[in-house]
C-alpha cells in the first residue's frame, strides 16, 4: 500500500530535533550559513545553505536528507534567489528556524 | 543494525513465476524508497525495479517492465517483487537495497544492501 | 536508454594511486555514486553526491564529478581495496549503473 509522504517528512524532522537535542559544543563550531526565505521551496534553499558546510558530520545526515526533497542537484557554492541577502547565522540557529517550520509544514499537511 | 533479509528465490522454468520478499529490520521500510538489483553470473549490477517511499510510485528498467511488479506491505515492512514470464536472462542474484527518503529519493543514495538472493530460471 | 560507461580494469601497485573513470552524457549535471564488491559480497556504498564518504568508508576514497566524467580516486591503495568498482547514476526514472571496474592490487 502507497505509504503517505507524511513518513518522510517525520524522519527529517526527527533528525533535526536529535540534532538540536544533542548539541553539547557549539554546532558545527559555531559555522555562519545563508540565511533563507522559509516561504517557499524551502528544501532547495536549506539545501543550498547547508551544503557549504563541510567536515561537520552532525549535520551530515541532514544534508543528505535535504537531497530527497530536492528535485535538482545541488553544489557548494550555488544560491537561489530565496536567499536572504547578505544575512547570515550560525548553523544551529539555522536548523532551529528550518526544524520550526518542517513541523509548522508537517501540521498543515504540506508534505512535498 | 539495519539490515534487510531477502527470500523467495529459487529455479524455475521459463515462463515461470517467483515472488521475492524482503524483510526489514531495525529502521522504518516505510519512509524510504526500496529498490532491487540484480547481477547475472560474472557480471555486472542491474538494476530493475523502484518503489517510491513518498506515495509509492513504482519505477522500472526495459527489461522487466509489464513482466516484474514491485510492491511494499507497510506493516510487515516487506518489499515484493513479483516476478512472472520468466527468461533465462533472468537468472542473476537479486539484491533488496534501502533507497532514498522523499519524493526524490533517487539523490540520496543506496545505503543498505541486503545478501541477495538466487534466481535460476532453466528448463 | 542513458549509458554509463567505465574501463573494464585498473592496476596498481600497494601504496600507489587508482583512478576509475565513468563517462555519461552531461554526467556532471547529476549525482554520481560508486560501490564497492568484493568477490562473493553484496555491494557497499563508497561516495554519495559525487564526492561525499559515507561513514565508516576510509578517507583514502575519494570523488569528483564534472563535465561527461565522474572519477573515483583511491590514493595510497591497499590489498583490501581490491575488488569491482561500479557508479551508479539517475536519468529519466531510472537508475543506471556503469559497466564495472576490476581494481587489481598487484
Known amino acids: 500500500s502507497p505509504v503517505p509522504p507524511s513518513t518522510a517528512l517525520k524522519e527529517l524532522i526527527e533528525e533535526l530535533v536529535n540534532i538540536t537535542q544533542n548539541q553539547k559544543a557549539p554546532l558545527c563550531n559555531g559555522s555562519m550559513v545563508w540565511s533563507i526565505n522559509l516561504t517557499a521551496g524551502v528544501y532547495c534553499a536549506a539545501l543550498e545553505s547547508l551544503i557549504n558546510v563541510s567536515g561537520c558530520s552532525a549535520i551530515e545526515k541532514t544534508q543528505r536528507m535535504l537531497n530527497g526533497f530536492c528535485p535538482h542537484k545541488v553544489s557548494a557554492g550555488q544560491f537561489s534567489s530565496l536567499r536572504v541577502r547578505d544575512t547570515k547565522i550560525e548553523v544551529a540557529q539555522f536548523v532551529k528556524d528550518l526544524l520550526v517550520h518542517l513541523k509548522k509544514l508537517f501540521r498543515e499537511g504540506q508534505f512535498n | 543494525e539495519v539490515q534487510l533479509l531477502e527470500s523467495g528465490g529459487g529455479l524455475v522454468q521459463p515462463g515461470g513465476s517467483l515472488r521475492l520478499s524482503c524483510a526489514a529490520s531495525?529502521?522504518?521500510?516505510?519512509?524510504?524508497?526500496g529498490s532491487w538489483v540484480r547481477q547475472a553470473p560474472g557480471k555486472g549490477l542491474e538494476w530493475v525495479s523502484a518503489?517510491?517511499?513518498?506515495?509509492?510510485?513504482?519505477y522500472y528498467a526495459d527489461s522487466v517492465k509489464g513482466r516484474f511488479t514491485i510492491s511494499r506491505d507497510n506493516s510487515k515492512n516487506t518489499l515484493y517483487l513479483q516476478m512472472n514470464s520468466l527468461r533465462a536472462e533472468d537468472t542473476a542474484v537479486y539484491y533488496c537495497?534501502?533507497?532514498?527518503?522523499?519524493?526524490?529519493?533517487?539523490?540520496?543514495?543506496?545505503?543498505?544492501w541486503g545478501q541477495g538472493t538466487t534466481v535460476t530460471v532453466s528448463s | 536508454s542513458y549509458e554509463l560507461t567505465q574501463p573494464p580494469s585498473v592496476s596498481v601497485s600497494p601504496g600507489q594511486t587508482a583512478s576509475i573513470t565513468c563517462s555519461g552524457d552531461?554526467?556532471?549535471?547529476?549525482?554520481a555514486f560508486w560501490f564497492q564488491q568484493k568477490p562473493g559480497q553484496s555491494p557497499v556504498l563508497v561516495i554519495y553526491?559525487?564526492?561525499k564518504r559515507p561513514s565508516g568508508i576510509p578517507e583514502r576514497f575519494s570523488g569528483s564529478n564534472s563535465g561527461d566524467t565522474a572519477t573515483l580516486t583511491i590514493s595510497g591503495t591497499q590489498a583490501m581495496d581490491e575488488a569491482d568498482y561500479y557508479c551508479?547514476?539517475?536519468?529519466?526514472?531510472?537508475?543506471?549503473f556503469g559497466t564495472g571496474t576490476k581494481v587489481t592490487v598487484l
Open positions: 537495497v534501502q533507497d532514498g527518503l522523499g519524493p526524490y529519493f533517487y539523490n540520496y543514495g543506496m545505503d543498505v
Open positions: 531495525g529502521f522504518t521500510f516505510s519512509s524510504y524508497a
Open positions: 518503489f517510491s517511499g513518498s506515495g509509492g510510485s513504482t
Open positions: 552531461k554526467l556532471g549535471d547529476k549525482y
Open positions: 553526491h559525487d564526492s
Open positions: 551508479q547514476a539517475w536519468d529519466s526514472s531510472t537508475y543506471v
